[in-house]
Each structure stands twice: as C-alpha cells, then as structure tokens.
Interface confidence: low
C-alpha cells in the first residue's frame, strides 16, 4: 500500500484465485483514543472500533472511503483504491491502446518545436467517475523538472456503438535547451482513477522524436507568364523554433488531381518556394519536416490551382 | 578550416557535408521507430558517447560569441563516431551489405572532421569505450543504438553549420 495523495491510498493486489489479499491497517487521524468507530462509504454499518482498523483487502468491495467517527462527528477519511495485477500483468483497462506506433501505446505525445513544450493525449471509452493526474521529468535517476497542466477532455468521437473520449495535457520543460542534443529522455507518468480502480501509464521519449511542425503558412500561387507553371510560395509556421537559419525545415510540395487515383507529382525542397505545373481542378499542398532529423511531417497546407 | 588561433571553418563546405551526413545516417538506419532502443538496457553502451550539451556554445548566441567551443565539441564527436564506425562493431559479423551506407557515412565523418581540423593541429579527443559485444545479435543492437545516437548528433552539427553558413561566413 502507498499514498497517492493526502488521505488517498493505493493497494496493490495480485488479482488471483484464493489470493489472501493485502492486510491494511488504517489509523484515524485524531488525538482521540477511545469511542472511535469505522464505516465504509455511505453505509452506517460499523466495521470496527478503536483508533486503528485492520482490514483484509481482496476485492473492489473492500475498497472505498473508510471514515472514522466519534459521537456522530467525522474525524478523518482514508480512500482506498485498488491497483490490479491480473495474471501477472498490471491492468490497463481505463485507457485504450492506440496501437500507434506500436502495440501497448496508451499515451501519445507531440511537440511543435524544440522549446521543451509538448502535448500528450490518450483515449478512453469511460465517461464518468474518471480522474487523471500527470507528472513528467527529464530523466528518471536524477530527474530535471517538467511542469504539466491539468488533463482536460479535448475531444469526443463516436466509434461504432461506442463513444470515445480524448484527454490531453500540455507540459513544459522548466529549463529547456532547444539547441542541445538530448541525452536523457522525457518521462511522462499518468495516474488514472476510475471509481475505485487505480492504473498508471508511462511514456518515455526525446523531444526530437515527437516533433511535428505545424503546416506551412501563407501558401500562395503566382502564375508564370505564358506558361502552365505557377510559383508556389509559403512561410515557416509561427510556432516553429527560431532562428530559421538554425532550426531549418524541409518541404514537400504535391500537386494532386481531383481524383485520388490520379498520379501525384511531388517535389522536395529546402526553399520556401517552388515552381510546379498546375493542372485543371488540381490542388497544391505543402508540408514541412525538420531538415536534419526525420521526425513526423506536418499536416498538409493546401490551395486550389484555379 | 578551424585553424590554431581560432579562425573560421569553411562554413559552407561544412554545411553541405553535415547535411549529407544527416541523409546518410538516416539511410543507414531508417527503421528507427520499429525498435525502442531505450527498452534494451543501453546504459553501458551509448552513455559514453559525446553529446552536444547546453553549455557547449552550439546555440545561435554561443556561436556568435565564440564558435570554437562548439566546433571543438563537434570535432570530438565526429572522431568518436568515426572510430566506432571503423571498429569491430561494424566490421564484424553479421557483415554489412556491400551497398550499405555505413562505409560512406564513415568516410564523410572523417571528411568533416578533417575540414574542422587540418593536420598538425590537435584538439583533445575523447577516448572511445572498449565495446566488444560477444554475440552477433548484440553487435546488431549496438549498431542500431550507435546510428540512432549519431542521427541526433549530426542533426545538431548540421544546424550549427547551416546557421554558421548563413550568418557567420565572411
């Protein structure tokens, strides 16, 4: 058993046949010594008396809010949550496996630049009685600070018969060094509590591996005289790291016909302009990627040829 | 070239060669995302590699103030990786394919380090750790880790030279 936060405790249980469970001793936070009784949740049934209560925690029925009273007055509470190890594996029931980039990916994170700011998100089908708390650090043995905000519900989607809820959190490395080569990964730890079930999820990454620039901005076309060619120009996204002479991007320019089956023409360039042939009813799209490290491409920015 | 007394390197040449190094490092080990190397207990293998750290003056401001600290750090790393790529880790079994980019990568590391330091002038270089994996699979894993680490190192070096070429070239 360990303390998650004040008056909230996590009991780690081997979810096993005939498992004896964990013996837990609760102590009433009071100077009083006698006349103390204990109850669980909303029940008025007295579970025991005295300053301490010893219980055997085996199932969810044994978890919940234990309260000690004296003469009708509440003295203190202890909330017991269960963390299940089922058939040798810690349970991961609360979050959905996103399966990208590999199986057992529950947390996904992205950064728009090298400033040390990143966003993580996760999915669940649970709509109520759900809380998350997020901690992060750079490295684990001698951790350096990363500050995370509160996790918030960022999207709701309908998937078949199910509703899916996306939660996200923003974090910022306290003393980020955008130009340095990372040697210690960022660690992100999410505590999830659904009703009386506790689970924890972790992710470890370098910022450089989760970089995904915003799409290029101000995408414009300039027809070239007496030609089917156009000059496409764009700018670095506002959110990208500066100076651009140091934090450089490379770009992919694509001409795509109306039909998805039509051949796509692609040009790669380090410049912020390119000359392409604009076909009727086609559109021109540009996306960006770090020039020197192959992290994710941005989403496309697009304009119609007409 | 970075010569004694600290005059400027050939920023544009360094820029071109470092960008080529980035391309080669990724073509030598493109499937980075398919293996989470941090799960493979790499403390004893790639912790000794020289990283370009915050105080090494490789940020735009540090380069403007005095690029020598940063260039020395980059040179150190280039020599380190050049030695690793020429070691038993890459020359031993399982043999690299004849068209593997590792050979080109090795030569380009040497080329860039020589651009930074001509004969007769010696910056202090870091000792290469004695890594001699006993099993072919260990060697394969070590190659992946070294190339992964090299990708991060040359990305920073390429940024340095690109910025230098754009803002510090005479």
């Amino acid at each position: 058993i360990w303390e998650l936060k004040k008056d909230v405790y996590v009991v780690e249980l081997d979810w096993y046949p005939d498992a004896p469970g964990e013996m837990v001793v609760l102590t009433c936070d009071t100077p009083e010594e006698d006349g103390i009784t204990w109850t669980l949740d909303q029940s008025s049934e007295v579970l025991g008396s005295g300053k301490t209560l010893t219980i055997q925690v085996k199932e969810f029925g044994d978890a919940g809010q234990y309260t000690c009273h004296k003469g009708g007055e509440v003295l203190s509470h202890s909330l017991l949550l269960l963390h299940k190890k089922e058939d040798g594996i810690w349970s991961t029931d609360i979050l959905k496996d996103q399966k990208e980039p590999k199986n057992k990916t529950f947390l996904r994170c992205e950064a728009k630049n090298y400033s040390g700011r990143f966003t993580c998100w996760w999915l669940t089908t649970i709509s109520t009685d759900l809380t998350f708390s997020v901690k992060s650090s750079r490295g684990s043995s001698d951790p350096q600070g990363v500050t995370c905000g509160a996790a918030t519900l960022s999207a709701e989607r309908v998937r078949g018969d199910n509703k899916e809820y996306e939660y996200s959190v923003e974090c910022q490395e306290d003393s980020a060094c955008p130009a340095a080569e990372e040697s210690l990964p960022i660690e992100v730890m999410v505590d999830a509590v659904h009703k009386l079930k506790y689970e924890n999820y972790t992710s470890s990454f370098f910022i450089r591996d989760i970089i995904k620039p915003d799409p290029p901005k101000n995408l414009q076309l300039k027809p070239l005289k007496n030609s089917r060619q156009v000059e496409v120009s764009w700018e670095y996204p506002d959110t990208w790291s500066t100076p651009h002479s140091y934090f450089s991007l490379t770009f992919c320019v694509q001409v795509q016909g109306k039909s998805k089956r039509e051949k796509k023409d692609r040009v790669f360039t380090d410049k912020t302009s390119a000359t392409v042939i604009c076909r009727k009813n086609a559109s021109i799209s540009v996306r960006a990627q770090d020039r020197y490290y192959s992290s994710s491409w941005s989403e496309w920015a697009s304009v119609p040829c007409s | 070239r970075a010569v004694p007394g600290g005059s400027s390197p050939a920023w544009t040449q360094c820029q071109q060669l470092s960008q080529k190094l980035c391309t080669l490092a990724w073509s030598a080990h493109p499937l980075v995302g398919h293996m989470d190397l941090r799960e493979e207990g790499d403390e004893e293998t790639t912790n000794d590699v020289p990283h370009i750290q915050c105080g090494d003056g490789c940020d735009p401001q540090g380069l403007r103030d005095n690029s020598q600290f940063c260039l020395q750090r980059i040179h150190q790393g280039l020599i380190f990786y050049e030695k690793l790529l020429g070691s038993d880790i890459f020359t031993g079994e399982p043999s690299l394919l004849p068209d593997s980019p590792v050979g080109q990568l090795h030569a380009s590391l040497l080329g860039l380090s020589q651009l930074l330091q001509p004969e007769g002038h010696h910056w202090e270089t870091q000792q290469i750790p004695s890594l001699s994996p006993s099993q072919p699979w260990q060697r394969l894993l070590l190659r992946f880790k070294i190339l992964r680490s090299l990708q991060a190192f040359v990305a920073v070096a390429a940024r340095v030279f690109a910025h230098g070429a754009a803002t510090l070239s005479p």
Epitope: W15, Y16, P17, D18, E59, E86, D87, G88, I89, D93 | -
Partner: antibody
Amino acid sequence: EFQLVQSGAEVKKPGASVKVSCKASGYSFTDHNMNWVRQAPGQSLEWMGVINPNYGTTTYNQKFKGRVTITVDQSASTAYMELSSLRSEDTAVYYCARRGFAYWGQGTLVTVSS
Amino acid sequence: DIVMTQTPLSLPVTPGEPASISCRSSKSLLYKDGKTYLNWFLQKPGQSPQLLIYLMQTRASGVPDRFSGSGSGTDLTLKISRVEAEDVGVYYCQQIAEYPFTFGSGTKLEIK
C-alpha cells in the same frame, strides 16, 4: 457458490463458425477476467484468449489469427467465444476459465466434420 | 511464445510412494515482484482441469498438503509426497508470466 455453465455440444461443417457461451454465477461477473482454453482429443491444453468483462478489452493468442472473437453480455453475466473458418483440427473441448484459472466451465465439445 | 517442456510423459507410481513432475520454461517466469507465475493443474478423466498450485508454490484451496510446488524461474517441480489412488490423471504446468499463456504437454500419472 461460483459456477461457470457452458452451452451444449456442437457439430459443424468445415468453413462454418461456432459460438460457445459461458454463464457465470455466484460472483461479480465484471470483476474477473474470463479466459478461453481448448483441448483437442488426447492433446494438451491451449490458451485462446482472455476478456475483461468490465471493459470488453481482449487479448488473443496470435495462433488463431483473427479467427477467434471473445465477447461478453454483462447483463446476462455471460461470456462468448466465437471461432470462424472452422477446420477439422478445431475439433476439441472448449473451456471457459475464470481469472487465475481456479474455476472452469464443464467444457463444450465442438466437432468439425464434413 | 514461452515453451513449457514437461517430463516425464508417463509416471507409474505405487500408492504411498512419492512422485515428482518436472517442467522447464524457455524463459524465466520469475517477475521483478519476486513471484514466479506458474500454475499446476490436475485433469482427471472426463473432467475439467482443476488448479492445484499457483504462483509456483501456493496451494489452491481444498488441495491436500501432500502436493507441493518448488523451483527456480525456469526449472519447476510438482511433488506428491505420498501418492493416493485419487491422484491419477494428467498433470499440466502453465505459465502466466506473459501472453500467450502456454501449457506443458502433460504428465500421465497412473497407479502401478
């Protein structure tokens, strides 16, 4: 008292599907994972997969490559195992077993024959 | 997948005598938490398997104390101190350290 009661024997043609049920009683159905295990005549036991009845999350033995689907009906406290594209080597007794494998159903014989 | 190799295939025993069944795992079943994730089952003719031992050495409820489990992370043993006529059947070991869970091929215990 804990009980797992399975559906009756089935005879199926190759290529068909079979759906075996397992009704749980005597405990909180959603609190415990449900495993499915099969045993071909004279052979050892083979684990097929597991479901968490509370959330519907499943883990399958890759050997069955998409042929097996495990589901639950919480309101009926029943777990189901469906096996598709049946072949003769799928002839076996199919068991459900509660988390930890302390409690087993009585088994359901599925015979695949043309 | 973890392979469980069980020996012997057949075990004829005289009532009152001890018996020992061995199970070798291709990968350690000992977790960082100090527990070894191995089960032993007995399947009597025409019945479902019944759990005898879990976590390598803990007897399931109602299992007589003549049954005991021991071993290391990879070499596991089930011992019966004095075999009785009701102990006949096929004994299986099973790992639940990682998915997919796998069983040994079985050991048939018969009375001499």
